[in-house]
Interface confidence: low
């Protein structure tokens, strides 16, 4: 029977800069029941706080709801593991909510084949930002990436769309069924998961000629 091993806070993520969650890996349990607590303070402030919500994020997590989340202020946090034989502390982790945003995938992905008479045909892809993101505030810039491939192909073709929420693709193989997905990331932060795939059948008369 030993004191617990050193825990490690290995990930913090926010869907929208308004809330965030951190997760830790327990160290060895020392053969005894172990309690974990996460404490934090905000850079330049005076108060030490305990994690406000150990439930929402699942096991070994701490969730910070809206009233506990401040942008532009660094959180300094550590996890304390305690059993009957003693305690151990994780290293301190510095968290700036601005840099841990991982949004939900974009929504309402729509894909259409357009065949105008006077121009080359193209695939028109359109989507909406994730619901939780408020782009009106001005301090949130989302960037988008599209990937598509014929249904049976192994390799994805990737296109960077910048801040646009629609995109045109000209070079496609006629007669093929394509899978299309989109994802987004804030200017500082992590890519979202890919959106659910949308399927589109490219007509056989879709021409790739100039």
């Amino acid at each position: 029977q030993l004191p617990p091993g050193k825990p490690e806070i290995f990930k913090c993520r926010s869907p929208n800069k308004e809330t965030f969650t951190c997760w830790w890996r327990p160290g060895t349990d020392g053969g005894l029941p172990t309690n974990y607590s996460l404490t934090y303070h905000r850079e330049g402030e005076t108060l030490m706080h305990e994690c406000p919500d150990y439930i929402t994020g699942g096991p070994n997590s701490c969730h910070f709801g809206k009233q506990y989340t401040s942008m532009w202020r660094t959180y300094i946090m550590m996890v304390n593991a305690t059993n009957q034989m003693g305690s151990s502390f994780s290293d301190e982790l510095y968290v700036d909510v601005t840099y841990i945003v991982q949004p939900d995938p974009p929504l309402e992905l729509a894909v259409e084949v357009k065949q105008p008479e006077d121009r080359k045909p193209y695939l028109w892809i359109k989507w909406s930002p994730p619901t939780l993101i408020d782009l009106k505030t001005g301090w949130f810039t989302l960037l988008y990436e599209i990937r598509l491939k014929p249904e049976k192909a192994a390799e994805w073709e990737i296109h960077f769309a910048g801040q646009q929420t629609e995109f045109k693709i000209l070079s496609l193989h006629p007669g093929q069924k394509y899978l299309v997905q989109v994802r987004c990331k804030p200017d500082h932060g992590y890519w979202s998961a890919w959106s659910p795939a949308t399927f589109i059948q490219i007509p056989s008369d879709f021409t790739m000629n100039d």
Epitope: H41, G44, E45, T46, L47
Partner: antibody, heavy 111, light 108 residues
Amino acid sequence: EVQLLESGGGLVQPGGSLRLSCAASGFTFDDYGMSWVRQAPGKGLEWVSLISWDGGSTYYADSVKGRFTISRDNSKNTLYLQMNSLRAEDTAVYYCTRGFDPWGQGTLVTV
Amino acid sequence: QSVLTQPPSASGTPGQRVTISCSGSSSNIGSNTVNWYQQLPGTAPKLLIYDNNKRPSGVPDRFSGSKSGTSASLAISGLRSEDEADYYCMIWPSNAWVFGGRTKLTVL
């Protein structure tokens, strides 16, 4: 520019009371925890009390617990320290602080 | 008597490097971050270093902080006459601030 201006210090008899104020300007007052720290003449710094941004949590040094009360009025951007049952050892310059920094210039309490 | 121990005095000549120590235990410095304050004669204390080794804007990079185990240090390089002041280490376990005893730095 952040400014903290303490007032209310003075000479008081042992057992008496004083109320210190700290007027804050130049920042969003209700974003910050605030503290009182004191310094007896020729001595080091001693933390007295602190209060959370919303006034919901207050903390005191053992030496003043039960005698001093920290409070704040966010509508007036003002921090207070009500000091009762004063003793000779409470004689000090009392500073208010925003978070860890900055500090006001202090007000002298002599018991 | 503070649980954080600082030397009562330190001294150096202009241009020298001076270090001020702050020692504690695993239950205080060992599990908390450390701040350092400078108090020039007749003025209020000023934050010099926070979270062990970070400098607030406006503090010259001649001042640096470090922490190892149960002790922390403040180093001042390129000592100047205006650095003559009292210096305090500080931690804040469980929402209570704890200051070290002061170190009076004399520039010879």
